[in-house]
Interface confidence: medium
């Protein structure tokens, strides 16, 4: 028996044991977040299945999601949102020894979908483990990019207080307008529930001591909140490794100066 | 034996005030959420609220919102629910129920006590 | 106005089956596990059910639930007399942040 004719994208295929890997990380975050101890993960599955499967991957829209962010409905306590922009892995570093703020991928649907690549077919009820479309060269609407659209959008209309954002100073663009941070998020901060957004620049070099504050795209980032009624600060990072430490440990007499 | 054991209840003016206690036993009271849940004469159940296992995170319904406060005493296994301000409509018995977590899964409600009766 | 709706009354003859419903929304009987609740005459409620369709130790396997997609529903099967109680479903609400109940179906055995 030949196989089937399969579309053929340039991205890499879904990843492996997707299914199980979803359900169980539903299951391991209900045990350990007991807020959201009654979520019924099966149907968490579900929703998240019937957003992409048998859909044209290149066809994926928020609405598709909506069933599953509406199971997913959870809140974040005002000033304790944390937003990123091309420093992942620090800022999970930081929720993890700051256990009351929250990224994204803090949260149940950022947490089942973290590292994840998935899609389907068009009037199958296959996934796709060949290849996934990829969002430069095939389509932006694909599962994965509406996904982390969707749930950004949420994420953001639901910040209160002041919101804070950790943005990569050693990037070229330390405030890029295409990020999911540029693109989506700061668009649906809402004026009337957020007070302020803090960013926080994130040095790379150890002998760096610019005012990384300054930087135009900075200034780009301030012109943009501040003309939607949002107060802007700014912070420099200049030793992430010191900052992480005193996050632990604040008491330590050398995290009396700055960082 | 797990056991609750509530107390407290009785007659009461309307804008007066009150507090339940519920006494648990035989189980490890620190670790478990505890719910109030109330049963006006005839009617149904109605959730109260709920309080977590160390006492920093409080939830509760609409009804009792501000008038109504849940709270523990993990050193003498005991759960409270004040209330002030009370109303004919909260006339009800009041149960205090646990919420179990057991091989990592929950249980809701799974141990009831046999209830207080609460006259305005 | 309760937030899941049940039928309030149900009847059946011993050994018969009989089955009750509830009825809700995408945010809580969709989202969550759903527990059911036997009350007998002048008692304290009891868990009959708890994650949809599991059945707490000593709770005799004529008792059932099941759940697809914003209903479920609770089954008796081989109805006996000492059945005869009130039933509530209940389950979290993720919108209103409050554990929600059905209004009560009484259960009568003819």
């Known amino acids: 028996v030949l196989p089937r004719w399969r579309q053929q994208w340039s991205g890499s295929g879904t990843t492996s044991r997707f299914p199980e890997t979803v359900l169980a990380r539903c299951v391991k975050y209900t045990e350990v977040h007991p807020e959201m101890r009654h979520v019924d993960c099966q149907s968490v599955w579900d929703a998240f299945k019937g957003a992409f499967i048998s859909k044209y991957p290149c066809n994926i829209t928020e609405e598709d999601y909506q069933p599953l962010v509406k199971l997913g409905t959870q809140t974040v306590p005002c000033n304790k949102t944390l937003l990123w922009s091309r420093i992942k892995d620090l800022a999970h570093q930081f929720t993890q020894v700051q256990r009351d703020m929250f990224t994204l991928e803090d949260m149940l649907l950022g947490y089942l979908a973290d590292d994840l690549t998935w899609c389907g077919e068009f009037n199958t009820f296959e996934i796709n483990y060949q290849s996934c479309p990829d969002w430069r060269k095939d389509c932006s609407n694909n599962p994965v990019s509406v996904f982390w659209k969707t749930v950004s959008r949420r994420f953001a209309e639901t910040a209160c207080g002041v919101v804070h954002v950790m943005l990569n100073g050693s990037r070229s663009k330390i405030f890029d307008k295409n990020s999911t941070f540029g693109s989506v998020e700061v668009h649906n901060l809402q004026p009337e529930k957020v007070q302020a957004l803090e960013a926080w620049v994130i040095h790379g070099g150890r002998e760096d001591s610019r005012d990384l504050c300054q930087d135009p795209t900075i200034k780009e980032l301030e012109s943009i909140i501040s003309k939607r009624n949002i107060r802007f600060f700014c912070k420099n990072i200049y030793r992430p490794d010191k900052f992480l430490q005193c996050v632990k440990n604040p008491e330590d007499s050398s995290c009396l100066s700055g960082i | 034996e797990v056991q609750l054991l509530e107390s407290g209840g009785g007659f009461v003016q309307p804008g007066g005030s009150l507090r339940l206690s519920c006494a648990a036993s035989g189980f490890n009271f620190n670790n478990a959420w505890m719910n109030w849940v109330r049963q006006a004469p005839g009617k149904g159940l109605e959730w109260v609220g709920i309080i977590n296992g160390d006492g920093t995170n409080t939830y509760y319904a609409d009804s009792v919102k501000g008038r109504f406060t849940i709270s523990r005493d993990n050193s003498k296994n005991t759960l409270y629910l004040q209330m002030s301000s009370l109303r004919a409509e909260d006339t009800a018995i009041y149960y205090c129920?646990?919420?179990?977590?057991?091989?990592?899964?929950?249980?809701?409600?799974?141990?009831w006590g046999q209830g207080t009766t609460v006259t305005v | 106005q309760s937030v899941l709706t049940q039928p309030s009354s149900a009847s059946g003859t011993p050994g018969q089956r009989v089955t009750i419903s509830c009825s809700g929304g995408s945010s809580n009987i969709h989202a969550n596990y759903v527990y059911w609740y036997q009350q007998l005459p002048g008692t304290a409620p009891k868990l009959l059910i708890y994650?949809?369709?599991q059945r707490p130790s000593g709770v005799p396997d004529r008792f059932s639930g099941s759940k697809s997609g914003t209903s479920a529903s609770l089954a008796i099967s081989g109805l006996q007399s000492e059945d005869e109680a009130d039933y509530y479903c209940g389950t979290w609400d993720n919108i209103l942040n409050v554990w929600v109940f059905g209004g009560g179906t009484k259960l009568t055995v003819l």
């Open positions: 994650r949809n369709s």
């Open positions: 129920a646990r919420d179990n977590k057991l091989n990592d899964y929950y249980y809701a409600m799974d141990v």
